[in-house]
């Protein structure tokens, strides 16, 4: 594939990554799939600066990120190490709350209205953010 050197139309560039901000809601798995079909992934937050950039764009709205613990431990969708990486949970979170009555606990992470993170039921239809890195090989065939 060819290297992507600029962001696609309607994506926003920041620190050598491209971001796309949804304006509708999907369940976490559907949002995850949407990003993958765009040759991207749900946003992976690795620094204060990236947190603030994303927060600036999404506003005070619940928004999915690429972090989940559906298979046990918390994992970032791109393989970034969770334990040693940036975290910005709300106080008392994550709590894997079972009291919502929807079955199971809470396995997917989202930005809350103040930007800090919460775990929630993955089926909730929240907005989402896709991210793809510039300079990575894209899956599209090169133009002839």
């Amino acid at each position: 594939g060819s290297e992507r050197t600029c962001c696609p139309v309607n994506w926003v560039e920041h620190e050598r990554s491209c971001y796309w901000f949804s304006r509708s809601g999907k369940a976490w798995a559907d949002a995850d799939n949407y990003c993958r079909l765009e040759d991207a992934h749900l946003v992976v937050v690795t620094s204060w600066e990236e947190q603030k950039f994303v927060q600036h764009h999404i506003g005070p709205v619940n928004t999915w990120m690429g972090l989940h613990d559906q298979n046990g431990p918390w994992k970032w969708v791109d393989g970034t190490d969770y334990e040693t990486g940036f975290k910005n949970w709300r106080p008392e979170q994550p709590d894997d709350w079972y009291g919502h009555g929807l079955g199971g606990g809470e396995d997917c992470a989202h930005f809350t209205d103040d930007g800090r993170w919460n775990d929630d039921v993955c089926q909730r239809p929240y907005r989402w953010v896709c991210e793809t890195e510039l300079d990575k090989a894209s899956q599209e065939p090169p133009l002839l």
């Epitope: 603030k52 005070p60 103040d114």
Partner: antibody, heavy 119, light 107 residues
Framework: QVQLVESGGGVVQPGRSLRLSCAAS????????MHWVRQAPGKGLEWVTV????????YYADSVKGRFTISRDNSKNTLYLQMNSLRAEDTAVYYC????????????WGQGTLVTVSS | DIQMTQSPSSLSTSVGDRVTITCRAS??????LNWYQQKPGKAPKLLMY???RLQSGVPSRFSGSGSGTDFTLTISSLQAEDFATYYC?????????FGGGTKVAIK
Amino acid sequence: QVQLVESGGGVVQPGRSLRLSCAASGFTFSSYGMHWVRQAPGKGLEWVTVIWHDGSNAYYADSVKGRFTISRDNSKNTLYLQMNSLRAEDTAVYYCARENSSSYYFDYWGQGTLVTVSS
Amino acid sequence: DIQMTQSPSSLSTSVGDRVTITCRASQNIISYLNWYQQKPGKAPKLLMYVASRLQSGVPSRFSGSGSGTDFTLTISSLQAEDFATYYCQQSYSTPYTFGGGTKVAIK
């Protein structure tokens, strides 16, 4: 109402240590990031350090890195600044400040405590 | 580190005048720019946050604008209680740096 009250300042010799405290009241202390900011006599404001609401992360200005340590005791609603290897240039009024968690500004400040480093 | 350059460093003006203070960041800080007012012997007081949002209780004669690297604090009609020193501060990236301050004095 929100109150932040610093204490522990005083005169100390170069190379010695001092611990500042900031007693918080009127809000849920454990939900907020807290900062120390200092101001040398007749000079401007200098950011010193921050600690996250749960104490899990801290960042420092280069000028104090390795010498100062920020900590907090959420059960006592108190913020601390341990200052070691003090230098003359650390002489300043030290303020603690509460950070708004959604927009990252300092919405409440203490009255300040003066630290004088002199032989 | 992000450098914050504030200008002017001081100005002499009169009650009723319009005052503009500028702050320039050495790199893009989006809108994470705050303004504080400080009077002698007192702690700083928040005026504006996220570049243009007025803190509760602050008079509407204060306004802020800008994004990216260039920001402005404006006092539309200076009042006697506004004579003070004003600081900008970026809260995008640690260390959270302040500008050098602007002292607004009576002419």
